[in-house]
């Protein structure tokens, strides 16, 4: 089978990646690679951001425009991604420059579905392989990246990278970031003159930008710091050993004082402002089932208290290269039963402390549309429905048939493509829908296909309540009530009157009321009455009665 | 006797165009959906495309939906592949298959097969 | 998609002996299961249908059995005919999927 397609029929050889940690970065910064521009053949031309330094391996899939669906994604902002044509050969790099902007919104954004795995994975503390983030929770503007095809990204203004790795063996989580500002906003490029003395910086100098990682140990509830500098500092009041400072509790404030013979006084006076302790958040799919075949819902959960300022936390998220600062997301106008991985972190005072990632497949989407190819009546008491099955997968087919406000409806095998219908009521229309469904999460129904027809004639019943009285010695008044069932299109009553076997009237009427005149006295007379439907004639109600001998 | 001849197959550059056909004998065509399966050299067998009666539904497989048509012409009794922006991946022999029909029921499993149609998509 | 997996890919095995190949269905399919004979050089033919109906034609030393997800084609008493590649299909849902088959050689 081809590569699963995405909702925009983009189809990734593997997931976008960056790693998170270990590839060497200039400077401590966010990395991302160049957009990757294919030339469509259809004549439109589509960019992609891609987070994989990999982008070659990118493919498109054959769908063509046919599977092409724009999505939204809603948290803090919403995000409507265009709607993205299909169905590319060539990578050939377009005229000018692709933009990604990040911060809750995206632009030229798509979400690819994960090639082959079906497993949901949900690993708070484990290592991300698939996202990198730009870390910049506390700017309110939006960060535009200018990048080049197959060149280094322009970095927003504040550059930054967020580490974190774990080890399955020692329960530790590691997490670091370095953030350099300059005043101006733009990346800060230190210079050093030369002096002719070499002099010590201070250690208030030296160590201005030490990053620290904090390490989480799940069974003591403790977390380290990490003090990332190369050569073996010391602390005062002996806080620290190999440059790790231990036991420290969350959500709470610790002093360390840095100092190292290659520095003069001050020593640096480090504040760590230790985050709260991992197991405190769960990511949970807050996905509404009935909503589940084409939206992803995701939000992190505070499953326990802790004293943390919750102003200093923030959240972040990555599906595919959409990037949002929500605790809460929710994607929309997905492919059904596609999977969609997405990345999460949670910082403290922007220092990464835990993340997670979620594969989540879509539910079974609503099964198309039965082709009904006829549907008509062959008899008075039957009909005929025949059909092509939805092309989606679907599970059993409703086959309903109203006539005037009856409605009875039957489950049908999702083989069948005829169904005789019995039983039916002669001359009356009938209305018939049927759709496929399928049994997921829900039941979801398809769009139902609707037919109609009239059964054939049958006789009419019987009419009913018939009299016949004297008006006088030589006349007679026939009467009767309608046919329960008249199953026809035309309404006539007809009467016939025998004197033995010989007919001496037939009269037919719109109404069941006769008036038989002229008959002879003492005569014994048979009345027929029957109903007419225009197509048969009914079964005849008899009675037998007498004119009396004349009075005068 | 059911007999299914496919033709139309041979050598087409990638980007390219071509037409299968497949001759179908010893039995009502127009009371049988039909389809085509493929199979890559040394691999297994792949669905591509199935028709009802009449031809008024189609239906697709992923990695051909958007280049590939499925059409019959039930007077002449045969079924047709249009196969459009070809790739080194459709390099198969292309099998029609009839498909199990009864007057009330379809089972999406294949009753006939032809003897298949070699195409290879090279430059 | 529905995956099936058909195992071993190849066996040998001589005429007269036993044999069992197996297919499974990455969920369930009830039993939406076809098995098929491929021959060089001949169309391919059709052995079993819905999990463990023989086709018309199907000599009875083949017989197929299972549902839901596990299947298995066992011949009996192999003839020199019988030795071929095997295929199983899953048509319970669109997209109809094959196995990767199973060779049958002679030993």
């Known amino acids: 089978q081809s590569p699963t397609p995405s909702p925009t029929g983009l189809t990734t050889a593997k997931m976008p990646s960056v790693p998170l940690s270990s590839d060497p970065l200039p400077t401590h910064t966010t990395a991302f690679s160049p957009a990757s521009t294919f030339e469509r053949e259809n004549d439109f031309s589509e960019t992609t951001t891609s987070l994989s330094p990999d982008n070659t391996s990118t493919q498109v899939s054959p769908d063509s425009l046919d599977n092409a669906s724009a999505f939204n994604t809603t948290g803090v902002s919403s995000v409507q991604t265009p709607h993205l044509p299909t169905h590319a050969d060539s990578q050939t790099p377009s005229a000018g420059t692709d933009t990604q902007t990040f911060s809750g919104s995206a632009a030229n954004a798509k979400l690819n579905p994960t090639p082959g795995s079906n497993a949901i994975s949900d690993v708070p503390g484990e290592r991300s392989t698939a996202s990198t983030f730009p870390t910049d929770p506390v700017s309110p503007l939006t960060t535009t990246l200018s990048l080049a095809h197959h060149s280094s990204a322009a970095l927003p203004a504040r550059t930054s990278n967020t580490t974190i790795t774990a080890n399955t063996s020692d329960a530790y989580l590691n997490a670091s970031e370095t953030t350099t500002l300059s005043p101006s906003g733009s990346a800060v490029i230190s210079t050093t003159t030369i002096a002719t003395t070499p002099s010590k910086p201070t250690c208030d100098e030296k160590y201005a930008n030490i990053t620290v990682d904090y390490l989480y140990n799940k069974e003591t509830k403790l977390f380290t710091a990490k003090l990332n500098v190369n050569e073996n500092v010391e602390c005062g009041n002996n806080t620290c050993t190999n440059n790790e400072v231990h036991n420290l509790t969350e959500c709470k404030n610790a002093s360390v004082s840095i100092s190292h013979n290659s520095c003069t006084a001050p020593d640096k006076t480090l504040i760590l402002d230790v985050p709260p302790g991992v197991e405190k958040f769960q990511l949970h799919d807050c996905t509404q089932v009935e909503k589940a075949d084409t939206t992803i819902c995701l939000k992190w959960k505070n499953i326990e208290t802790f004293t943390c300022d919750t102003q200093n936390i923030t959240y972040r998220f990555q599906c595919g290269n959409m990037i949002f600062d929500n605790k809460e997301i929710k994607l929309e106008n997905l492919e059904p039963e596609h999977e969609y991985k997405c990345d999460s972190e949670i910082l403290y005072n922007n220092h990464k402390f835990t993340n997670a990632s979620k594969i989540i497949k879509t539910d079974f989407g609503s099964p198309g549309e039965p082709q009904i190819i006829f549907c008509r009546s062959e008899a008075a008491h039957q009909g005929v429905i025949t059909w092509n099955p939805p092309q989606r997968s679907f599970h059993n087919f409703t086959l309903c048939y109203i006539k005037e406000t009856e409605k009875d409806c039957l489950n049908l095998d999702k083989n069948l493509i005829k169904y005789d219908l019995q039983n039916l009521k002669p001359y009356t229309k009938y209305v018939l829908s049927l759709h496929a469904y399928i049994i997921a999460k829900v039941q979801r129904n398809g769009s139902a296909a609707m037919c109609h027809f009239t059964t054939k004639s049958a006789p009419p019943s019987q009419v009913w309540n018939m009299t016949v009285s004297m008006t006088s010695d030589n006349s007679m008044h026939v009467k009767c009530r309608p046919p329960r069932d008249r199953n026809g299109p035309h309404e006539r009553y007809h009467l016939e009157v025998e004197a033995g076997n010989t007919l001496v009237r037939n009269e037919s009427h719109k109404n069941c009321d006769f008036r038989v005149k002229d008959l002879q006295y003492s005569t014994d007379y048979t009345f027929k009455a029957y109903f007419h439907n225009g197509d048969y004639p009914g079964e005849p109600f008899i009675l037998h009665h007498s004119t009396s001998y004349n009075s005068k | 006797e059911v007999q299914l001849v496919e033709s139309g197959g041979g050598l087409v550059q990638p980007g390219g165009s071509m037409k299968l056909s497949c001759a179908a004998s010893?039995?009502?065509?127009?009371?049988?959906?039909m389809a085509w399966v493929r199979q890559a050299p040394k691999k297994g067998l792949e669905w591509v495309a199935s028709?009802?009666?009449?031809?008024?539904?189609?239906y697709y497989g992923d990695s051909v939906k958007g280049r590939f048509t499925i059409s019959r012409d039930n007077a002449k009794t045969t079924l047709y592949l249009q196969m459009n922006s070809l790739r080194s991946e459709d390099t198969a022999t292309y099998y029609c298959?009839?498909?199990?029909?009864?007057?009330?029921?379809?089972?999406?499993?294949?009753?006939?097969w032809g003897p298949g149609t070699m195409v290879t998509v090279s430059s | 998609d529905v995956q099936m997996t058909q195992s071993p890919s190849y066996l040998a095995a001589s005429p007269g002996e036993s044999v069992s190949i197996s297919c499974k269905a990455s969920?369930?399919?009830?039993?939406?299961l076809a098995w098929y004979q491929q021959k060089p050089g001949e169309a391919n033919k059709i052995l079993i249908y819905?999990?463990?109906t023989l086709q018309s034609g199907t000599p009875s030393r083949f017989s197929g059995s299972g549902s839901g997800t596990d299947f298995s084609l066992t011949i009996r008493n192999l003839e020199p005919e019988d030795f071929a590649v095997y295929y199983c299909?899953?048509?319970?849902?669109?997209?109809?999927?094959f196995g990767s088959g199973t060779k049958l050689e002679i030993k």
């Open positions: 299909q899953q048509y319970d849902e669109k997209p109809l999927t």
């Open positions: 028709m009802s009666f009449a031809g008024s539904s189609t």
């Open positions: 010893g039995f009502t065509f127009s009371d049988y959906y």
């Open positions: 969920k369930s399919i009830s039993n939406y």
């Open positions: 819905s999990g463990s």
């Open positions: 298959a009839r498909m199990y029909t009864t007057d009330y029921y379809l089972y999406w499993y294949f009753d006939f």
